[in-house]
């Protein structure tokens, strides 16, 4: 296994609709044709997997149907979008990239993006 540098923004603020997007960029040492991207959430020293996708270079990044993540890839950059976020989902979201093919296998883990989610204030009742 070889190490690989992964860069991602330090902080992102989710939209009022609970959507957060960020770019995960990896320093590929060669021409990888099979890449696995995983988003992990670290909160209170607990790490959980948010979503993962394997893609062949030049093809679309496809997550599972019930995934809260979507994404696109361009070269060594992956544009990730996480939706359905609420205030309780605030935390550090870590991008992990694995170059599965061709050998050798490379593993890169970013420092994480702190995503802040603020639940929108409920609209006040209107009297007509």
């Amino acid at each position: 296994c070889k190490a690989m540098h992964v860069a991602q923004p330090a902080v992102v603020l989710a939209s009022s609709r609970g959507i957060a997007s960020f770019v995960c960029e990896y320093a590929s040492p060669g021409k990888a044709t099979e890449v696995r991207v995983t988003v992990l959430r670290q909160a209170d020293s607990q790490v959980t997997e948010v979503c993962a996708a394997t893609y062949m270079m030049g093809n679309e990044l496809t997550f599972l149907d019930d995934s809260i993540c979507t994404g696109t890839s361009s070269g060594n950059q992956v544009n990730l979008t996480i939706q359905g976020l609420r205030a309780m989902d605030t935390g550090l979201y870590i991008c992990k990239v694995e170059l599965m093919y061709p050998p050798p296998y490379y593993l890169g883990i970013g420092n994480g993006t702190q995503i802040y989610v603020i639940d929108p204030e409920p609209c006040p009742d209107s009297d007509f």
Epitope: C1, E34, V47, K96, E98, M100, Y105, L107, I109
Partner: nanobody, 119 residues
């Protein structure tokens, strides 16, 4: 705890065939690269063949056209079909799984199975 258990080794004549199997106790097939390595006496352990979750396959030059690696996710098993065996294929064959789980790099090895090619 993941365990890799190889089987199928043995003594075979030159030109013969064997099929090695590697059964995993945990479901590591969907996320990790599975491979076969071999180690001859007094030599280092070398990659024979590997297969990725996406089905991409890599072979050592010395076995191309003779060996075939495959996997069965339903059975959590990876296979190495070895045809046209030569005396220089004699070695202990090891199953390997490598990749990551959460933030940790993982690598698992089987205990090895002996393949001897001799007349």
């Amino acid at each position: 705890e993941v365990q890799l258990v190889e089987s199928g080794g043995g003594l075979v004549q030159p030109g013969g065939s064997l099929r090695l199997s590697c059964a995993a106790s945990g479901n590591i097939f969907t996320r990790n690269v599975m491979g076969w390595y071999r180690q001859a006496p007094g030599k280092q352990r070398d990659l024979v063949a590997s297969i990725t979750p996406g089905g991409n396959i890599n072979y050592a030059d010395s076995v191309k056209g003779r060996f075939t690696i495959s996997r069965d996710g339903a059975k959590n098993t990876v296979y190495l079909q070895m045809n046209s065996l030569k005396p220089e294929d004699t070695a202990v064959y090891y199953c390997n799984a490598h990749g990551s789980i959460l933030l940790d790099r993982i690598e698992y090895w089987g205990q090895g199975t002996q393949v001897t090619v001799s007349s």
